[in-house]
Every structure is written in C-alpha cells, then in structure tokens.
C-alpha cells in the first residue's frame, strides 16, 4: 500500500527493525541466538532464547536440563517445552511418598484396605488410597469395593503397620508406614536380621530422606538424603542430578549427595553453549594440534566457523592444500597439543580451563 | 600463580569497534591455546573463538568476519578485535587458558573478572 511506504523506509533504515509486510508494522529484530515468541516482535522482552532440545529456559534464563521420566515407576504427566521442564508422576496404581522438583523419588503401590475396612478416598498420583471402617452390618466381603462404601462420620483412622518379615511373608503386598503396600519385589529389599527391631512402619519427619549415618542423641551430624540420581541443592530440596547420556557428553563428576552430576564434552570436543552443570551444545574441537614445532604464521593462519559434523567425526587435522603443506604422517590425537607442551603449560588445572576468581564464585 | 586479566571493554555504538586485551601472568601463551567467552545477562556462556599456540584462529559463526583474534608473546598478551559491532554482542567477555580442558556448565566462574562490552543502538 502506498500509504505504508514512509514507515516501511523508515523501518528499514533502522539495522534494529524491519518491515513485515503481511501485519504491515515495522517489527524489532530479535537479535543473534533469540527467537520470536510472536510474528512481529515489538521490542526485546519479544525475544526468547532457545534452548537445545531437552533443555528449558529456567526462570533466571538459563538453560537447564529437563528431568527424566525414564524410571520404571514414572509416566511423563507434561513434556519438556521452552519454558518448563518435563513433569514426571507415579505411574498409575502408585503414589508419590517422596516428591523432588518435577519428579518423585519413590513411588510406592497404593494400599488396599485390609479387611473390615473400605475405600474412604481412592490413591492418586500424589496420595496413598485413605481406608476407613466398614459400616455396622456391611459384609466383610464388601470391605474393599468402592462401590461397597457407605457414608461414615468416624474419624479417619491409619492402618497400623504391621511388620512383616518379607523372607517369611507370603503377602504379595506389605504394609509400611501409613498402611502403604510395597509390591514385593520392592519390599524384599527390606529385610533385617532376625530378632532385629523392625523399622518398617516408623514414623519419620522426612520420608524418604535418611541420616548419613545413625544419629547419637544430641548431635546435629545428620543430614537429609535424596533417593539416587538427585542431590541435596542449596535449598534443601531433592533435585535431578543432571543426565550425561547425550552422545557427546561425558561424565566429569559424579551425582553427589549435595551435588549434581556434571558432565563435559567427550574428548576432542569443546563446549560451544554452555547450561548448568553440563553442555547445550559440543562442537569437534577446531584446531588440530601441530606435529611438532610451531607452523609459520602466515602458512598456519587459518579461520573456520563452529559447526557440528554428526557424533563421532572430529575435525579435517590434514593441512588445507591452499597452505601448499603436506598432510601430517601421523593422526595426532587431540590433546597432543597440551601434552606435548605440557612443559610450558606450568600450572594450569587440567579440570577445567582455568580458575582465578578467589572469591569462590 | 596463574592469573589471566581481561581490559578494553566499554559502551559503544551499534558499527563501532573495540579492541580487547587478556594478560596473563604465571605461564606463557606459547603452551596452551587461549579461547574468549562471552556471558550476556541471563544468557548461558557462549564460545566466541579460539586462537592456538601457533597463531591459527577459529570464531563461532556469528561473529566470523567482524572480530579477529590475535596474539604477542613476547607479551604474553592475546587481543580480541570486535568491528561493526551489534547490540546483540553485548556480554561480558573472557578470556581462558586451554579451552580444551571443557567448562563445568556455567563457564564463566572459571575465569577472572572478564571485561563488559555494551552495544548500544
């Protein structure tokens, strides 16, 4: 439209905007690496960045690996998307006794109401199913049905737990703490030495958590632990120990009772976008290391961009022919580089590229 | 000890240049190779370039034909050169010893104080 024209030139004469023509406005230009969340965007908070897949967009804008659901015992409740992580929950017939951000840490079977008791609320994903007493002159029969159930204006009570030696028991359930069932393959892990007393059943402020070790009376030696493949974080919640499954990742530290997991580029790769505790994105490391001695600069001088050949390639090490060299005899290895220099290296940590903030930032 | 210091940072205007400047003390830069890293708010840290003990120089794609990399031995200084600058290369940058020992996630605590460019438009 003609009428459009001034604010199309003058759009275009600036490097921060351009013109759309199917909404007719003049729209801000996300800049490098960020991406629109509408089809005009009109100024920067328009913008987003975009993590790699897997990855979320945390709320201090940082991308953060989402958690896994790949347990056994977890269904994905909703999927990874830009700005939330996946959301896991028990799988159906289990309930959540331990919850950790997003996730749950141990599920357990829902309890069925033993006899002389019925179905007060049934389990969901989050609770264990609540029983109560069957009414006056309901057939024990009916003490599990729900369709058995009658109003009852008692109290609700707890099923006391009972504890069962699962090497004697013949249950296919046993009862823990709460009138939770445990299926018995996950209570066969409970056994104790006979004449023991049982903790099955004992009270805890902090399911699922334990002490590092026996409490003495008094001390303050204890500490919460998370189940396996989470961490104590700063906050003193259990959260997902990062995963370094990704092809070009390796593990660099392990998950630690209050630390995560860290994970690096596998060797001959280096980290080109970085996340939290780990890597959005490995690129083959770029320079090839010289045989021996140092090239002439104006045949080594050579520029090339940060791209990401499939899983498994490393970079051309083979001089270009437009430097007029040969091709190496030999393959050097990656690191070569660093370890046939390592004299001249002096201290530098091997760990990580090199630390100098005293300030334990 | 080794110590690596960033300088040569400021506000400029969109199309401008810069010159940036790493010094480092307690090794010399004719071992390792040397790499610069940005970190814009909120952002993760991203790899800008790297040069090698021997001189040859590689730049991530967005960058590539706007900012050189170089080097002076006798010294022990590595520059970082940025022209037509864009808002978008606003970030703090660093500079870091052998970029192949890789970063723990947040790469930018690893490093020293690093120095600001700010592009405005």
């Known amino acids: 439209f003609p009428q459009d024209r001034p604010f199309e030139d003058t759009c275009r004469g600036n490097p921060g905007h351009y013109y759309d023509k199917a909404v007719r406005r003049c729209c801000y230009r996300c800049p490098t690496g960020l991406f629109p969340t509408q089809q005009c965007p009109q100024r920067p908070a328009d913008c987003r960045k975009q993590c790699e897949p897997d990855y979320y967009l945390d709320e201090a804008g940082r991308c953060t690996a989402c958690v896994s659901c790949s347990r056994d015992d977890l269904v994905e409740k909703m999927p990874c998307a830009w700005n939330s992580s996946r959301v896991c929950e028990c799988q159906p017939g289990m309930f959540c006794a331990v919850s950790v951000v997003n996730s749950c840490a141990r599920c357990f079977f829902h309890s069925v109401c033993p006899a002389g008791m019925i179905v007060k609320f049934p389990g969901t994903a989050q609770k264990n199913t609540v029983c109560e007493p069957a009414s006056p002159g309901v057939s024990p029969a009916c003490a599990s049905p729900e369709n058995c159930k009658e109003p009852s204006s008692g109290t609700i009570p707890q099923a006391k737990p009972t504890p069962v030696s699962p090497a004697t028991s013949n249950a296919s359930t046993m009862p823990l703490r709460g009138g939770t069932r445990l299926a018995q393959e996950a209570a066969s892990k409970l056994t104790r030495a006979p004449g023991s007393p049982s903790s099955v059943g004992r009270p805890s402020s902090d399911p699922g958590l334990s002490p590092t070790q026996p409490c003495p009376q008094g001390s303050g030696d204890c500490r919460k632990q998370c189940e396996p493949d989470y961490y104590l974080d700063e906050a003193g919640r259990c959260t997902a120990c990062v995963s370094c499954s990704r092809d070009d990742l390796v593990e660099k530290t392990p998950c630690a009772w209050n630390s995560s997991r860290i994970c690096e580029c596998r060797p001959g790769m280096i980290c080109a976008t970085s996340a939290t505790n780990s890597c959005a994105r490995c690129v083959p490391y770029p320079i090839c290391a010289a045989e021996t001695g140092t090239k002439p600069q104006d045949m080594a001088e050579k520029d090339t961009t940060f791209e990401a050949p499939p899983v498994g390639t490393q970079p051309d090490c083979s001089p270009t022919p437009e430097n007029g060299e040969a091709p190496a005899s030999t393959s050097p290895t990656l690191s070569s580089l660093v370890d046939s220099q390592a004299s001249k290296t002096l201290p530098i940590p091997t760990s990580a590229p090199i630390a100098l903030s005293s300030t334990g930032k | 000890q080794v110590q690596l210091v960033e300088s040569g940072g400021g506000s400029v205007q969109a199309g401008e240049t810069l010159r940036l400047s790493c010094t480092a003390s307690?090794?010399?830069?004719?071992?390792?190779?040397m790499a610069w890293y940005r970190q814009a708010p909120g952002n993760e840290c991203e790899l800008v370039s790297i040069i090698s003990a021997d001189g040859r120089t590689y730049y991530t794609d967005s960058v590539k034909g706007r900012f050189t990399a170089s080097q002076d031995n006798a010294k022990n200084t590595v520059s970082l050169y940025l022209k037509s600058l864009q808002p978008e290369d606003t970030a703090v940058y660093y500079c870091a010893a052998d970029p192949r020992r890789n970063c723990r996630g947040n790469c930018c605590g690893n490093w020293g104080p690093g120095t600001q460019v700010t592009v405005s438009s």
């Open positions: 307690g090794f010399t830069f004719d071992g390792p190779d």
